[in-house]
Interface confidence: medium
């Protein structure tokens, strides 16, 4: 069956995140993959759209994040765009209302986004073949 | 061609408060970001705050927080920093800065003095 447009938006999106590093992207993040073994792939991505939403939710207006130059701030400010978006294709693509993240493993944002990437690029790559 | 004109500055004592203004012409004002960069003497550029287009959006560095109000007229095509509780580390020349993406077009900014 064809691809979900969510989920080439979803790979669009992890690409520009991936690329370009920011003074946050080393800060961490509940590592939901760390024991993802019993979880359905809805519950993987609900889990996914929750630590991203905890993240910028915290960190939009964080000084340290911001920065003192002005590209600094606008990488953080893309930085938080795409996570966003990152967020709500996810939410789209889960189909739930919410999911419980207790894992106690953390991981770097960046780790985090390149594992996701991963997933994503594997999914891809089974409903396109 | 993109022009922006500050005003407002001036000597003021610690603890005073000053109100800039930034005229902007020559683009569409509502469209854009706008930010407040300063420079203090003998160092870099550095942002003091920033705002969305339609003003509900709202950053400022730490060293500001507090004590710093940005605002923006879009009737007017007007940028504002209201600086209260003014210290002599605050003492800059401070721009006001069209914004998409990084900061793009300045003004020739206005000096502001702290000092007893």
């Known amino acids: 069956h064809k691809c979900d447009i969510t989920l080439q938006e979803i790979i669009k999106t992890l690409n520009s995140l991936t690329e370009q590093k920011t003074l946050c992207t080393e800060l961490t993040v509940t590592d939901i993959f760390a024991a993802s073994k019993n979880t359905t792939e809805k519950e993987t991505f609900c889990r996914a759209a929750t630590v991203l939403r905890q993240f910028y939710s915290h960190h939009e207006k964080d000084t340290r994040c911001l920065g003192a130059t002005a590209q600094q701030f606008h990488r953080h400010k893309q930085l938080i765009r795409f996570l966003k978006r990152l967020d709500r294709n996810l939410w789209g693509l889960a189909g739930l209302n919410s999911c419980p993240v207790k894992e106690a493993n953390q991981s770097t944002l960046e780790n985090f986004l390149e594992r996701l990437k991963t997933i994503m690029r594997e999914k891809y790559s089974k409903c396109s073949s | 061609e993109v022009q922006l004109l500050e005003s407002g500055g001036g000597l003021v004592q610690p603890g005073g408060s000053l109100r800039l203004s930034c005229a902007a012409s020559?683009?569409?004002?509502?469209?854009?970001?706008m930010a407040w960069v300063r420079q203090a003497p003998g160092k870099g550029l550095e942002w003091v705050s920033w705002?969305?287009?339609?003003?509900?959006?709202?950053y400022y560095a730490d060293f500001v927080k507090g004590r710093f109000t940005i605002s923006r007229d879009n009737s007017k095509n007007t940028l504002y920093l209201q600086m209260n509780s003014l210290r002599a580390e605050d003492t800059a020349v401070y721009y006001c800065?069209?914004?998409?993406?990084?900061?793009?077009?300045w003004g020739q900014g206005t000096l502001v003095t702290v000092s007893s």
């Open positions: 020559g683009f569409t004002f509502r469209n854009y970001g």
């Open positions: 705002i969305g287009q339609y003003g509900d959006e709202t």
């Open positions: 800065a069209k914004s998409l993406g990084r900061f793009d077009y």
